[in-house]
């Protein structure tokens, strides 16, 4: 059974990676660039399904892609601290909460979506978790 | 210029295993955001997608075919592969390399391969 | 798997005819549309990604427009290199699918 110290390391990872995620969106829907265009038209996929802290194992599969759009949209108008070590950090996180354990085999839904889709996503999936921990 | 260029057995026997790679040239398969496709056309039909790769090995195939097929990169060597098990002659069809950028139009293709599903 | 229904299946024009092609996506595809120009013998060749963006070096003639369900494809003014079979493709949704194509044949 989780401990209190587990639920709350648990609570403040979620936290640690809703803020990653809101900083990346924040900086996409504040971004005045040519390049904008483009990168919507990148699909992202979405879990069929993500209610539990091992369906994040979807997210991890998509980070790679959301790596390549952020370092598209690099510019004077839109600077996120180095993409690769916050991608890499997402990751950390990411691989800690789902867990090790068991592998899933990630359930994508039929449809697509934008990368402002994805991150607002995986943002409710985030809130929607850490209020259930508190 | 990226180019694509497809190789691979033109004649398969039925239940047999259908391989094929595609070579890329003038560019990197690692490049950023770029995914590697398999299509196909049946004789005077339409296209169907068949699968992707990304550099980093992730792959996504149409669930109609999912169960025969396999797709795997070799960044190496800068080429990527299909593997079609248990071909029919329904599979008898020109087979397609493709890039697209972000799972989106196929905005690179090979000059395609003649594939025959015949004993 | 979304179905593409283009129209016509085949159509004859002449030179400096205007040509409109539609597609219809059995489901929105928001405007996540592409049309390809296949000549025989040869691989596709993508003319308008998202509905009404013009692939590089993709002449000024052909044009896109449509969102949800329902888009065209117009050859302003149809040049004898324009004779082909033309196909829209959605990428909204997985698999990707393509329509049937239609084929533009000289009068």
């Known amino acids: 059974a989780p401990t209190s110290s587990s639920t709350k390391k648990t609570q403040l990872q979620l936290e640690h990676l809703l803020l990653d995620l809101q900083m990346i969106l924040n900086g996409i829907n504040n971004y005045k660039n040519p390049k904008l265009t483009r990168m919507l038209t990148f699909k992202f996929y979405m879990p069929k399904k993500a209610t539990e802290l091992r369906h994040l194992q979807c997210l991890e599969e998509e980070l790679k892609p959301l790596e390549e759009v952020l370092n598209l949209a690099q510019s004077k108008s839109f600077h996120l601290r180095d993409t690769k070590d916050l991608i890499s950090n997402i990751n950390v996180i990411v691989l800690e909460l789902k867990g090790s354990e068991t592998t899933l085999m990630c359930e994508y839904a039929d449809e697509t979506a934008t990368i402002v889709e994805f991150l607002n996503r995986w943002i409710t999936f985030c809130q929607s978790i850490i209020s259930t921990l508190t | 210029q990226v180019q694509l260029q497809e190789s691979g057995p033109g004649l398969v026997k039925p239940s047999q295993t259908l391989s094929l790679t595609c070579t890329v040239s003038?560019?990197?398969?690692?490049?950023?955001?770029?995914?590697w496709n398999w299509i196909r056309q049946h004789p005077g039909k339409g296209l169907e997608w068949i699968g992707y790769i990304y550099y980093s090995g992730n792959t996504h195939y149409n669930p109609s075919l999912k169960s025969r097929v396999t797709i795997s990169v070799d960044t190496s060597k800068n080429q990527f592969s299909l593997k079609l098990s248990s071909v029919i002659a329904a599979d008898t069809a020109v087979y397609y390399c493709?890039?697209?950028?972000?799972?989106?139009?196929?905005?690179?293709w090979g000059q395609g391969t003649m594939v025959t599903v015949s004993s | 798997d979304i179905q593409m229904t283009q129209s016509p299946s085949s159509l004859s024009a002449s030179v400096g005819d205007r040509v409109t092609i539609t597609c219809r996506a059995s489901?929105?595809?928001?405007?996540?549309l592409n049309w390809y120009q296949q000549k025989p013998g040869k691989a596709p060749k993508v003319l308008i990604y998202?509905?009404?963006s013009f692939q590089s070096g993709v002449p000024s003639r052909f044009s896109g427009s449509g969102s949800g369900t329902d888009f065209t494809l117009t050859i302003s003014s149809l040049q004898p290199e324009d004779f082909a079979t033309y196909y829209c493709q959605q990428s909204h949704y997985i698999p990707r699918t393509f329509g049937q194509g239609t084929k533009v044949e000289i009068k």
């Open positions: 003038g560019g990197s398969i690692s490049s950023g955001g770029y995914y």
């Open positions: 489901q929105t595809i928001s405007s996540y």
């Open positions: 493709a890039r697209d950028w972000g799972r989106d139009a196929f905005d690179i």
């Open positions: 998202a509905a009404s």
